[in-house]
């Protein structure tokens, strides 16, 4: 996290805050419901109250506006600058402006404005952008999903550092951000795409380019926001520029960033019968067309030229893989080698010898 | 509907740099990812870039370094800045909204020449 410099913020706990104006985007309800959802969002962890004025001058003002709106700092028509604030202090101090030009929503459409609010009241508070993608206060905009919004971890810090905590945190889950270098980390699924690896970790995925060692952190949803924000594995076809995405009993096909049509499609069509409610890992060799999937404590193969599982399957992972242990979380191959990650460890296979040829700690990928 | 036109092709020695446009009608380009294929003379048609609608980015192997993908979403335009060119980008060059099921561009060629 972040604070401005000189730590601005308020010297009393009880704020205000005024709607100036409203967009046509949305019902005058949906807006005062957005903003006092997000306002509750820090309010839950500080001693911080809002109250709601509707005329007057408040601490924080809040309006609509286009292009440039009275303050010098225009706004710049649809996408782009979304919204800004001002730090705590008197005049502008602590006001949030949003630029109509936007399309503002309270879904996944368009801005969601409750997402967006609840940022830029974190700059109202005295917070500045966060370098953890996984901070609300990260700038960069992602919708994070339908699910109830948790507060992550890098922003409690934050605002705590400013105000201390509350009373009494309704909702003291405050997801963290994974630390790649953490010695018992575990990682959920590993896939190839145009050249990059992607390694996946709760919402999130390490993106590492080849000859490069530093890995960029982004959350899953930023590069494909209809997908889940956690997945349990992955795999590339590359000649048909294809990754496949798998959660519990659905997979997705993807092209670069787009969704093909017609997915999601339940994994039974893949040939698995129900008793399988999810599949732990999967890696595809183009050589020989196969893919390999783990469930639980069993290995499938599947045809991918012929599109059907293979004869003798499942197997167990003890007998055709020995030494990697009966589960697998992520898998992925490289020039005639297997990489199986199970728990914080992972095993280089050798596919021709059938061997274990090295053991080494699964963040080594990362370059930890 | 969103219809695509490129423009920028043409021929360059090696080394050079040749700076491509893709102009998109319709309102809608900003919602989704934009992309650059090629297709050398008998060889199949290959990603070369992409870009998200949140502007992330996303280069084959062989173009890393050498190629930048921008867009304007204002202007409903996208970009390809392509520097050091080598004999081999050698191809017609597509442009891309929304992935292979979405819609094409008919091409520029572009020729680098020894």
């Known amino acids: 996290y972040n604070v401005f410099p000189r730590t601005l913020k308020w010297s009393k706990t009880n704020l205000t805050y005024r709607i100036v104006n409203y967009t046509p985007d949305l019902t005058h309800s949906e807006v005062e419901k957005a903003f006092k959802k997000a306002f509750k969002v820090w309010s839950d962890v500080t001693p911080l109250n809002f109250t709601r004025l509707h005329d007057g001058t408040a601490d924080i003002m809040i309006s609509f506006g286009t292009k440039e709106h009275g303050d010098f700092y225009p706004f710049d028509g649809p996408s782009g600058l979304l919204a800004h604030a001002f730090p705590p202090g008197p005049n502008y101090g602590g006001d949030a402006h949003f630029d109509d030009d936007e399309t503002w929503t309270s879904s996944s459409k368009g801005y969601n404005l409750f997402l967006v609010a609840a940022h830029e009241f974190g700059h109202s508070l005295g917070l500045d952008h966060s370098k953890d993608p996984g901070a609300l206060m990260f700038p960069i905009y992602t919708y994070t999903g339908k699910s109830h919004f948790m507060l992550p971890d890098d922003d409690v810090q934050g605002i705590q550092s400013l105000y201390g905590p509350g009373d009494e945190d309704p909702n003291p889950r405050h997801p963290k951000t994974p630390d790649k270098c953490d010695p018992s980390l575990s990682l959920d699924a590993i896939t190839s795409l145009r050249g990059e690896t992607m390694i996946f970790k709760d919402r999130f995925f390490w993106r590492l380019h080849p000859q490069q060692v530093d890995a960029e952190l982004f959350l899953t949803k930023s590069f494909w926001p209809e997908l889940p924000n956690r997945i349990d594995a992955a795999y590339e076809h590359p000649s048909r520029d294809l990754i496949f995405i798998f959660r519990g009993r659905k997979y997705w096909a993807l092209n670069g960033y787009d969704i093909l049509e017609g997915y999601p499609q339940k994994i039974s069509e893949l040939g698995f019968p129900k008793e399988v409610k999810k599949i732990s890992a999967a890696v595809h060799f183009e050589d020989t067309g196969k893919t390999l999937f783990f469930s639980g404590n069993q290995v499938w193969s599947y045809d991918d030229t012929n599109q059907i599982m293979d004869k003798d399957y499942p197997r167990l992972i003890e007998e055709d893989f020995p030494g990697i242990g009966d589960k697998v979380d992520a898998v992925y191959e490289k020039n005639g080698y297997i990489y199986f990650f199970n728990g914080p460890i992972q095993f280089e296979y050798n596919i021709w010898s059938k061997r274990i040829v090295r053991v080494m700690p699964a963040n080594s990928l990362l370059w930890c | 509907e969103v219809q695509l036109v490129e423009s920028g092709g043409g021929s360059v020695q090696a080394g050079g740099s040749l700076r491509l446009s893709c102009a998109a009608s319709g309102s809608t380009f900003s919602r989704y990812s934009m992309n650059w294929y090629r297709q050398a003379p008998g060889k199949q048609r290959e990603f070369v870039a992409g870009?998200?609608?949140?502007?992330?980015?996303n280069y084959a192997v062989s173009v890393r370094g050498r190629f930048t993908i921008s867009r304007d979403n204002a202007e409903g335009t996208g970009y390809l800045q392509m520097n050091s060119l080598k004999p081999e980008d050698t191809a017609v060059y597509y442009c891309n909204a929304g992935g292979l099921q979405g819609y094409w561009g008919l091409g520029t060629q572009v020729t680098v020449s020894s």
């Open positions: 870009i998200s609608v949140g502007r992330i980015t």
